[in-house]
């Protein structure tokens, strides 16, 4: 079966955006009026896996790059990294669990959950201009919760 | 038995705001993706505005980015689109309809609440 | 954007006919393709998606098919309930646009 991708943009809960830092690495801080074309277009995949009601397994690329969010083991610690892969063979139904997300709505706000490693989720900082991480507490200082907007191809 | 009563229409001046709001009811609110779909008199269907079942997600078309805003209150199962800086063009038949998970086709609709906009 | 062109526009049939509307588009959307009825006066009602499962309530009559960039909408046997106007509407990518319609109407 073929993935379907739709275009989106994330913000997290502090309203900060998501940008590019370098090649490989995210970073969260806030944007306003043409500044926000800087922001990422993620092209979110609706991939394999095991779904409910509320939780929805994602991929998470970059809009017209062939980089892809993913989590990997880096010195023990699971991390969040952007991945490099072949675009013929990208996006594909069955992601390698590395790339998977699980999309979570609680009330108005959306979690993501590693796949690979249950109860990490993609985090910001408190802090302008930190990089985007994984992170393995939920509530605390730092930010796991985002709104999503989807936008045109 | 899934009903969905838009109101809040009616006659506008250009430049004008309205909100519009769907009561729903015979069925879980709270675990379905909304949109908001409107029809020009005797034109075809445009889909203008969307949201997800918490609210976390929302979609607008270019037709209408920055002036419409789409809201829900899953505790009054009442689905909302605010209308600002409104034009002749937005006049339409405004539908609202449940979505399946993942925005994908719309299974049932309102009867719907006409916007007129004209000075 | 992915473009929907519905033909034809209008068609005129007799109850029992078997009547035929093409939805073509200008991308490839797989199988992700609804069909929809609207009644004079009346809110559009879901009749097919996926392409070709009916949904719930909808007389076998109605039928779809196709994929990739051509689909069909089939009623086998016209009834008088039937005459109104459907619509296509595509969920592959946003926007999610619809056909500009075809009507059905009595002969």
């Known amino acids: 079966a073929p993935v379907r991708s739709l275009n989106c943009t994330l913000r997290d809960s502090q309203q900060k955006s998501l940008v590019m830092s370098g090649p490989y690495e995210l970073k969260a801080l806030h944007l306003q009026g043409q500044d926000m074309e800087q922001q990422v277009v993620f092209s979110m995949s609706f991939v394999q896996g095991e779904e409910s009601n509320d939780k929805i397994p994602v991929a998470l690329g970059l809009k017209e790059k062939n980089l892809y969010l993913s989590c990997v083991l880096k010195d023990d610690k699971p991390t969040l990294q952007l991945e490099s892969v072949d675009p013929k063979n990208y996006p594909k139904k069955k992601m390698e669990k590395r790339f998977v997300f699980n999309k979570i709505e609680i009330n108005n706000k959306l979690e993501f959950e590693s796949a690979q490693f249950p109860n990490w989720y993609i985090s910001t900082s408190q802090a302008e201009n930190m990089p985007v991480f994984l992170g393995g507490t939920k509530g605390g200082q730092d930010i796991t919760d985002f709104t999503m907007q989807f936008v045109s191809s | 038995e899934v009903q969905l009563v838009e109101s809040g229409g009616g006659l506008v001046q250009p430049g004008g705001s309205l909100r519009l709001s769907c009561a729903a009811s015979g069925f879980d609110f709270s675990r379905y993706d909304m949109s908001w779909v409107r029809q020009a008199p005797g034109k075809g269907l445009e889909w203008v505005a969307y949201?997800?079942?918490?609210?976390?997600?929302?979609y607008f078309p270019d037709t209408v980015k920055g002036r419409f805003t789409i809201s829900r209150d899953n505790a009054k199962n009442t689905l909302y689109l605010q209308m600002n800086s409104l034009r002749a063009e937005d006049t339409a038949m405004y539908y609202c309809?449940?979505?399946?998970?993942?925005?994908?086709?719309?299974?049932?609709w309102g009867q719907g609440t006409l916007v007129t906009v004209s000075s | 954007d992915i473009q929907m062109t519905q033909s034809p526009s209008s068609l005129s049939a007799s109850v029992g006919d078997r009547v035929t509307i093409t939805c073509r588009t200008s991308g490839n959307i797989h199988n992700y393709l609804t069909w929809y009825q609207q009644k004079p006066g009346k809110a559009p009602q879901l009749l097919i998606y996926n392409a070709k499962t009916l949904a719930d309530g909808v007389p076998s009559r109605f039928s779809g098919s196709g994929s990739g960039t051509q689909f069909t909408l089939t009623i086998s046997s016209l009834q008088p309930e039937d005459f109104a106007n459907y619509y296509c509407q595509h969920f592959w990518s946003l926007p999610f646009t619809f056909g500009q319609g075809t009507k059905v109407e009595i002969k």
């Open positions: 949201i997800s079942s918490g609210g976390g997600s929302t």
């Open positions: 309809a449940r979505q399946n998970k993942k925005l994908t086709w719309f299974d049932y």
